[in-house]
């Protein structure tokens, strides 16, 4: 049994840390393998997590972790029964993937006006809270090449777009999704799409 | 909220025994490792001793060795230090505290142990 | 055993003005990833030990910013940029680099 493709892990910044791997052959990850993870301070203790299947030959691993600080390493241990497969260490705050906007929402009924708002993953005390920017991604089911993307620079979890540069009487979906410039972060999975049909009133023609 | 909560101090005649406990909540407690300090009244911090999130590692300073003894029983989130043959001077508070990035990350109220005749 | 020796032992302050308190080891506490093994603690009068500093430098969640923690190796320093009523007690550094944790003996700050 070996290693084919080495463990990469991404931090959530807040208490989660997800490595994933390809083994040499179809394996059964939960049964066969452990990952040991231990944070490199004194009095710390290896901590174990059990892999789950992702694909034939692929593994991923849910570490729980406290709050990240930069200053966190971890040592990571790949284990199958006594052969010790990998060795290597993970830096969360230097591979952090933000968490997920959600309760995005879409409000139809200021005038002519658009407003989505949706809700900032991380609580007011962890240090990603303030440092999200977002984008957010509007396409009509009806016609795939009607695809936008709007960039959220601001703080507020908010985007407010006039009706009228989306067509009237078709129906959208949008989604939304994070990154953190500080971190040189990935950007996050994108949220659950929310749907609505859009309409508004023409203006009259002028002739 | 991260919560410690001591108790078993008391007044004890010098060379008897006492056991102190700290009942700990709000966070999974089997995951860190966990120290006894003490305060002698009006004086300093001065660490006990420690012990790893299994309990399979124990630590303590030298001068408590072989008199103190610290241990954990993970199903109950209990902390506890067996203390035999007091002295005068260990006569303090004794404060469990939660270890995180090698220092302490919360800590309890405290429990007074006095040692006299 | 790392012996941390605190100075000043009393620090008399006046609301608003800064404060520093000193710590040194007898051994460096600077580690291969570059940082130094060191907490500062402060003990409100009455009340248990709370976290301020950790890693030297590091302010602890809910810290205010007023308080700093700087320098490396053997020699440390906290500092209050404006000392308010609500800062009294006594300030402790620790070294977390290896058993036996050691404590420095103490800085008492109070009000002028």
């Known amino acids: 049994m070996k290693v084919l493709q080495e463990p990469t892990c991404v931090s959530d910044y807040m208490s989660i840390s997800t490595c994933e791997w390809k083994m040499n052959g179809p394996t059964n990850c939960s049964t066969e393998l452990r990952l040991l993870y231990q944070l490199v301070f004194l009095l710390s203790e290896a901590h174990t997590c059990i892999p789950e299947n992702n694909g034939g030959a692929g593994c991923v691993c849910h570490l729980l972790m406290d709050d990240v600080v930069s200053a966190d390493n971890y040592t990571l241990d790949l284990w199958a029964g006594q052969q010790l497969l990998w060795k290597g260490s993970f830096k969360p705050s230097e591979h952090v993937k933000p968490r997920a906007p959600g309760n995005l929402t879409v409000h139809t009924n200021v005038s002519d006006t658009l407003l989505l708002t949706w809700s900032n993953p991380y609580p007011p005390d962890n240090y990603l809270y303030n440092h999200l920017t977002y984008a957010v991604n509007i396409w009509s089911e009806n016609d795939p090449a009607d695809f936008r993307i709007y960039n959220v620079t601001y703080l507020e979890p908010s985007l407010r777009i006039a009706a009228s540069t989306l067509k009237s009487g078709i129906s959208y979906r949008a989604r939304v999704r994070a990154w953190a410039q500080c971190y040189n972060t990935t950007w996050s999975e994108w949220s659950p799409s929310t749907k609505w049909h859009n309409s508004y009133r023409e203006p009259f023609e002028q002739h | 909220e991260v919560q410690l909560v001591e108790s078993g101090g008391g007044l004890v005649q010098p060379g008897g025994s006492l056991r102190l406990s700290c009942a700990a909540s709000?966070?999974?407690?089997?995951?860190?490792?966990v120290s006894w300090v003490r305060q002698a009244p009006g004086k300093g911090l001065e660490w006990v001793s420690a012990i790893g999130g299994s309990g399979g590692r124990t630590y303590y300073a030298d001068s408590f060795k072989g008199r103190f003894t610290i241990s954990r029983d993970n199903s109950k989130n209990t902390l506890y230090l067996q203390l035999n043959s007091l002295r005068a001077e260990d006569t303090a508070v004794y404060y469990c505290a939660r270890h995180l990035r090698g220092g302490f990350w919360g800590w309890g109220q405290g429990t007074l142990v006095t040692v006299s005749s | 055993d790392i012996v941390m020796t605190q100075s000043p032992l009393s620090l008399p302050v006046t609301p608003g003005e800064p404060a520093s308190i000193s710590c040194k080891s007898s051994?460096?506490?600077?580690?291969?990833?570059?940082?130094?093994?060191l907490d500062w603690y402060l003990q409100k009068p009455g009340q248990s030990p709370q976290l301020l500093i950790y890693l030297g430098s590091f302010r602890a969640k809910g810290v205010p910013d007023r308080f700093s923690g700087s320098g490396s190796g053997t020699d440390f320093t906290l500092k209050i940029s404006r000392v308010e009523a609500e800062d009294v007690g006594i300030y402790y550094c620790?070294?977390?680099?290896?058993?036996?944790?050691?404590f420095g003996g103490g800085t008492k700050v109070e009000i002028k």
């Open positions: 709000g966070f999974t407690f089997s995951r860190y490792a």
């Open positions: 051994q460096s506490l600077l580690e291969g990833q570059g940082y130094n093994r």
């Open positions: 620790m070294q977390t680099s290896e058993t036996p944790l050691t």
